[in-house]
């Protein structure tokens, strides 16, 4: 039966379907053709090495000619599967998860230093020291290799689920600019959530103009509260609050705002160095040093969920925290405010003062 729509046509994983006047077609990568990208132009059945000339095997797989269409067979590298080695292999049993190769890493876990040699999944991203204390950002992701692919700027469909942190939006960006146009960026930060709609800033990569263009759209809050500990004192952070919110909204591709307490005050609290239980007398006499801010944020997905590709919104605060932890772990968190840690917390009614 001839496929009449993209729903009926099975394109290989990672290959988009296009509706054309002559019916649906897979947008084949170079060197592949046919309705389902299974054949090679000009390759007769049983062709020799021509079928491998287009290097159809991905991720280090080796290609061998084959007598039947698509006239090649891929021998995939470890961790990859699929006709063209395009998909990460299913996660093996937990026992096969790579162990932490360095004995020294056990002692370095949680010491507030991101130790490069311990920054791997087997070592728990140095016990969270490299992942903003979220532990393993990919702990819910079943495809084993997704942490490797997170930073490769290519769409890896098996990693594009919420649990796998949307493959760092690689499948969603689709060639569009991934960051706010530098020409607009300063303007958008200065005019973020100022009550005026600036259409040039009303894009996900510029933070949706702080919802200035969405006053008619009802709020759609993600579950929970995103809690950030920022190593800037509250007065300094609040001085640049629009810039802070705009940049974070742009990173998470949704809208963020400070959670307000019962008095309408932004929930930004001084962060004092946490002290261990048994503290010497001299220590208790020290005035507590304010070394940062604890910031409580709400995630409003109203525009994220309205956008054409609305399958990339963070459903809860913890998944947004995991995404920030993942960016930190791969050293790609372009955010000019130094974060100590991030976490998602269940939503409770706002109180006048939140004990920390």
């Amino acid at each position: 039966r001839v496929a009449r729509s993209c729903r009926e046509l099975q394109c290989p994983v990672g290959v988009p379907c296009q509706q054309t006047p002559r019916g649906p077609r897979c947008a084949c990568p170079p060197g592949l053709s046919g309705p389902s990208c299974r054949s090679f132009p000009g390759s007769p059945p049983g062709a020799s090495n021509a079928s491998c000339a287009a290097a159809p095997c991905l991720h280090g797989g080796s290609c061998r000619p084959a007598p039947l269409a698509p006239f090649f067979r891929c021998a995939c590298a470890q961790g990859w599967t699929g006709p063209r080695c395009e998909a990460p292999a299913a996660a093996p049993e937990v026992s096969e998860e790579p162990r932490c190769p360095r004995a020294a890493c056990q002692a370095k876990r949680g010491d507030q230093r991101c130790d490069r040699e311990c920054n791997s999944p087997g070592c728990g991203w140095d016990g969270g020291d490299c992942s903003l204390s979220v532990g393993d950002p990919w702990r819910q992701c079943e495809a084993l290799q997704c942490w490797r692919l997170f930073n490769n700027s290519r769409c890896d469909p098996a990693c594009s689920s919420p649990a796998c942190l949307y493959d760092n939006f690689d499948c969603h960006a689709g060639g569009r600019e991934r960051t706010c146009n530098p020409v607009y960026e300063k303007y958008c930060a200065d005019h973020f959530a100022d009550g005026r709609c600036d259409q040039g800033c009303n894009t996900e990569e510029c933070g949706w103009d702080g919802l200035d263009c969405a006053s008619e759209v009802p709020a759609l809050l993600a579950r929970g509260v995103l809690v950030l500990t920022v190593l800037l004192p509250p007065e300094e952070l609040l001085r640049s609050s629009a810039d802070f919110l705009q940049r974070l909204s742009a990173i998470l591709r949704t809208s963020l705002r400070f959670r307000l307490d019962a008095h309408g005050q932004a929930m930004v609290f001084p962060y004092h160095r946490p002290s261990p239980g048994s503290e010497p007398r001299a220590r208790r006499e020290l005035a507590p040093e304010v070394i940062g801010s604890v910031v409580m944020l709400e995630i409003d997905n109203r525009l994220c969920l309205q956008s054409p590709e609305n399958d990339h919104c963070f459903p809860d605060a913890q998944s947004a925290a995991d995404y920030l932890g993942a960016l930190s772990a791969v050293e790609r968190l372009d955010f000019p405010y130094p974060l100590r840690d991030v976490r998602g917390e269940p939503l409770e009614p706002p109180e006048p003062s939140v004990p920390l």
């Epitope: 002692a107 010491d111 507030q112 230093r113 130790d115 020291d129 220590r283 020290l286 405010y337 130094p338």
Partner: antibody, heavy 119, light 107 residues
Framework: QVKLLQSGAALVKPGASVKMSCKAS????????VTWVKQSHGKSLEWIGE????????NFNEKFKGKATLTVDKSTSTAYMELSRLTSEDSAIYYC????????????WGQGTLVTVSS | DIQMTQSPSSLSASVGDRVTITCKAS??????IAWYQQKPGKAPKLLIY???NRYTGVPSRFSGSGYGTDFTLTISSLQPEDFATYYC?????????FGGGTKVEIK
């Protein structure tokens, strides 16, 4: 307020060792890493290594492994650095600093200890 | 290990001049850069941390920018007390390397 007070200048012979101290006050000593930095005359700053007073864990610049030994005495809030097998190359000012949480910028510095290696 | 290369190694400028010092990392370091000022016979002083945040008490004429591998310290209007040597430093991962320094002298 936060203070780091270092021991006085030392004149030592080649091949000998020297141990300098850095006494911290004005903050909870075990909460911050103590870092040591070398500055030879007219030269740039070199990161030697750091120690966590809480765990005793250390990180070193490869260049100073085997040269510098870092220790702490929590009871007196004092960090120590011992330099061994001294040569003229080790003549320098040595600073101790407080490494800030997670990122390790240095907002507080000791006044420095001048070590001169000469026969 | 990641190298931090500062340029120029020295420069001459007059009071009121705008001065720009650059620091290049041999690999991506994100925002993980600090800048220090050092005067002869004194310990260094922290000016900027995490690429662009001015430390408490540092005058607003000092600003930092950059991300990844290329960073800049700018003094918008040089004052007499700003003649000193400036260092960049890599943060977050050890080794916490310093740049070679830039000496700002009076023209």
């Amino acid at each position: 307020q936060v203070k780091l007070l270092q021991s006085g200048a030392a004149l030592v012979k080649p091949g000998a060792s020297v141990k300098m101290s850095c006494k911290a006050s004005g903050y909870a000593f075990t909460d911050y890493w103590v870092t040591w930095v070398k500055q030879s005359h007219g030269k740039s700053l070199e990161w030697i290594g750091e120690i966590s007073p809480n765990s005793g864990g250390t990180n070193f610049n490869e260049k100073f492994k085997g040269k510098a030994t870092l220790t702490v005495d929590k009871s007196t809030s004092t960090a120590y650095m011992e330099l061994s097998r001294l040569t003229s190359e080790d003549s320098a000012i040595y600073y101790c600093t407080r490494g800030e949480i997670r990122y390790n910028w240095f907002a507080y510095w000791g006044q420095g200890t001048l070590v001169t290696v000469s026969s | 290990d990641i190298q931090m290369t500062q340029s120029p190694s020295s420069l001459s400028a007059s009071v009121g001049d705008r001065v720009t010092i650059t620091c290049k990392a041999s690999q991506n370091v994100g925002n993980n850069i600090a800048w220090y000022q050092q005067k002869p016979g004194k310990a260094p002083k922290l000016l900027i941390y995490y690429a662009s945040n001015r430390y408490t008490g540092v005058p607003s004429r000092f600003s930092g920018s950059g991300y990844g591998t290329d960073f800049t310290l700018t003094i918008s209007s040089l004052q007499p007390e700003d003649f000193a040597t400036y260092y960049c430093q890599r943060l977050y991962n050890s080794p916490f390397t310093f740049g070679g320094g830039t000496k700002v002298e009076i023209k």
